[in-house]
């Protein structure tokens, strides 16, 4: 008789990323007997929840159950029923909920309570919903990309998994951009740190890693835009804000109450003689860049070197994977290629921002106008953040790799979070098992 492969013993895990602008559900799978190996867990599904981030449900938490239904039902379909009860479900909320918690602990707790109650109604092994720290978000993003790139593996490979993978075991730094915060995480050359708050020590697969990480709350792309508008409206002579970060001909009315709703704009808050103002785009990259730079306080640094706002940043070291909104924005702008220099990126941004709004709308007819209108700002912000905020240079720009997926799994904190909570990253190098996961009889 023909040799037949025994069915693999497959395990699944679910992580919900409750971000500031939306929630995504990720389903991961791995062969059970290989769960301590590196690189065996991969993403099988991403389900984007329809609607805004959970922090926007503060006054309608009774709708959270319905909000989560479609993606949780999708998970029910994708994961075999026999596996449901042993499939862990984790929900991690990031900066949107951190900001809500700053405003009201009671409201943030209520949202999480209702999320927990909703998720507990499914047949999975629900493990809780919590607001993860910025440090965790940075660290888990770093673990994810290095796990997927095979950097923790002690076996040297004769082949390359992804184009920018080198066979050395030097880890990649992680650059993560969300709507409300941004994280930078990497292993610096110098093992001693001037700022213990930014230092993490890991022992993974028998190797020690001294990692630098920082999360800048309010410096995600959406909150950075609110900050910029709040800063610029202070000096506007009337209720018209001529804004270089929007395309020429673009117009939008903004409520002052919306502008000052977020804790991120508190430092710019003032009594204005109007309740609304109109953004009028003038599309000038250079002026937009200058306006964005004013969000970064670089005049004060109590360390040998800082990023901005007095936050320690050691000298950059090695390659970096830039993911989440870093990737989404640069991918939209067609600027993710390894061959595009920083000078070329700047040139293309200048060209893009100066294009008239009507022309842009025609060229990208399928894109929602709300998102489309903000790419000039977002692209400019990314350049400013990387160059002036984190001190990348024209030379070191080539060490930034804009990454969406690695081996079919999204780059982001969720995989690292699950690997940690399921104890799938051992401190020591596991002994290799004699059998592969497909055994033939």
């Amino acid at each position: 008789t023909q040799n037949k492969a025994l069915p693999e013993n497959i395990k699944y895990g679910i992580v919900l990323d409750a971000g500031s602008s939306h929630t995504s559900l990720y389903i991961y799978k791995w062969p059970a007997e290989k769960e301590n190996d590196t690189g065996v867990v991969h993403q099988v599904e991403e389900c984007r929840v329809k609607g805004p981030g959970i922090s926007k449900y503060v006054q309608k938490v009774n709708e959270i159950g319905i909000y989560l239904t479609d993606c949780m039902e999708r998970a029910r379909e994708v994961i075999p029923r026999s596996q449901h009860q042993e499939t862990p479900v984790y929900l991690g909320a990031t900066a949107g909920m951190r900001l809500l918690r700053m405003e009201s602990e009671e409201l943030a707790d209520r949202v999480l309570d209702v999320v927990e109650r909703s998720l507990s109604n499914y047949p999975f092994d629900f493990q809780g919903a919590r607001i993860i720290t910025g440090q965790e978000e940075g660290a888990y993003g770093w673990i994810t990309i290095n796990y997927l790139l095979g950097k923790f593996s002690q076996k040297t490979r004769w082949f390359s998994i992804v184009p920018y993978e080198t066979n050395n075991q030097e880890t990649f730094g992680a650059l993560d951009l969300g709507g409300a915060s941004t994280q930078i995480t990497f292993v610096p050359q110098n093992q001693t740190t001037e700022s213990p708050d930014n230092a993490l020590q890991f022992r993974l697969y028998g190797k020690d890693y001294n990692v630098y990480t920082h999360s800048f709350l309010c410096y995600g792309k959406d909150q950075a835009l609110w900050q910029k508008l709040a800063k610029d409206i202070q000096v506007a002579s009337n209720e018209i804000l001529r804004d270089p970060c929007f395309h020429p001909g673009y117009k939008k009315v903004v409520n002052v109450s919306d502008l000052y709703k977020t804790p991120c704009t508190k430092r710019f808050e003032m009594t204005l003689p109007f309740q609304q103002f109109e953004i009028q785009g003038i599309g000038n990259y250079q002026q937009c860049h200058q306006s964005v730079l004013e969000l970064f306080n670089t005049s004060y640094c109590p360390y040998s070197q800082c990023a901005f706002n007095g936050i320690f940043l050691p000298p950059l070291q090695g390659d970096f994977g830039a993911f989440s909104a870093f990737y989404f924005v640069m991918n939209f702008l067609n600027l993710t290629s390894e061959k595009v220099s920083q000078e070329k990126v700047t040139e293309m941004m200048k060209k893009f921002c100066s294009q008239p709004w009507e022309e842009i709308k025609t060229s990208y007819a399928g894109v929602k106008e709300k998102y489309l209108s903000e790419y000039c700002f977002s692209g400019t912000y990314i350049l400013s953040l990387l160059l002036q905020g984190y001190h990348f240079t024209a030379d070191s720009w080539e060490h930034i790799h804009f990454i969406g997926k690695i081996q079919g799994s999204d780059a982001g904190w969720t995989l690292g979070y699950m690997l940690n909570l399921t104890n799938m990253i051992p401190a020591e190098q596991p002994l290799s098992t004699p059998l592969s996961h497909s055994t033939y009889v």
Epitope: Q59, K60, R110, N255
Partner: antibody
Framework: QIQLVQSGPELKKPGETVKISCKAS????????MNWVKQAPGKGLKWMGW????????TYADDFKGRFAFSLETSASTAYLQINNLKNEDTATYFC??????????????WGQGTSVTVSS | DIVMTQSQKFMSTSVGDRVSVTCKAS??????VAWYQQKPGQSPKALIY???YRYSGVPGRFTGSGSGTDFTLTISNVQSEDLAEYFC?????????FGGGTKLEIK
């Protein structure tokens, strides 16, 4: 203590516009939504909809879509109801009522004193 | 829309009596029902939420019961200050709706 104080009575002609205010005090304005309820003379209560004071999102009952507009002035902890192109059938007392979370759902726990609007030519 | 029917427009009672005001929903609304008291020339005052939970400060003589489609507000040991109109209200589905009201008269 928690209070919702509404603006005074209004006498208007058909076709005109009226804007009623509801000033909240004693709690954090943006932590609770605001409902609007109509009570025509000698009639029952009719829910008009609510405004999310945190996001600005508007929810209108079908009968109140079109000429009716809810708005906010967050800095003044005030919600507004504007009725455009007034008709005789808009003659009523309008109440604002706080939307609060009790036992897994939202109720109207505190009410304004009401604003009487009379539409007459 | 869910129709909330308060079949008795008026109810007459005496001080010290026990009276029950009823309300019927056209569809199942679970326990998402509230009761309000409105005195002449005043705004409604919240008495009961979630069908049977009293707001703080509401006297113990007011009790709510029911679930699904049938709900009752009971006032035991009626006082003269209870002279008012009582409205039931469902907040289970949009649009939220109110009953037509029951006026309580004191003999």
């Amino acid at each position: 203590q928690i209070q919702l104080v509404q603006s005074g009575p209004e006498l208007k002609k058909p076709g005109e516009t009226v804007k009623i205010s509801c000033k909240a005090s004693g709690y954090t304005f943006t932590h609770y939504g605001m409902n609007w309820v109509k009570q025509a003379p000698g009639k029952g209560l009719k829910w008009m909809g609510w405004i999310n004071t945190y996001t600005g999102e508007l929810t209108y009952a079908d009968d109140f879509k079109g000429r009716f507009a809810f708005s906010l002035e967050t800095s003044a902890s005030t919600a507004y109801l504007q009725i455009n192109n007034l008709k005789n059938e808009d003659t009523a007392t309008y109440f604002c009522a706080r939307r609060a979370y009790y036992r897994y759902d939202y109720v109207m726990d505190y009410w304004g004193q009401g604003t009487s609007v009379t539409v007459s030519s | 829309d869910i129709v909330m029917t308060q079949s008795q427009k008026f109810m007459s009672t005496s001080v010290g009596d026990r009276v029950s005001v009823t309300c019927k929903a056209s569809h199942n609304v679970g326990t998402n029902v509230a009761w309000y008291q409105q005195k002449p020339g005043q705004s409604p005052k919240a008495l009961i939420y979630s069908a049977s939970y009293r707001y703080s400060g509401v006297p113990g003589r007011f009790t709510g019961s029911g679930s699904g489609t049938d709900f009752t507000l009971t006032i035991s040991n009626v006082q003269s200050e209870d002279l008012a109109e009582y409205f039931c209200h469902q907040y289970n589905n949009y649009p939220y709706t109110f009953g037509g009201g029951t006026k309580l008269e004191i003999k």
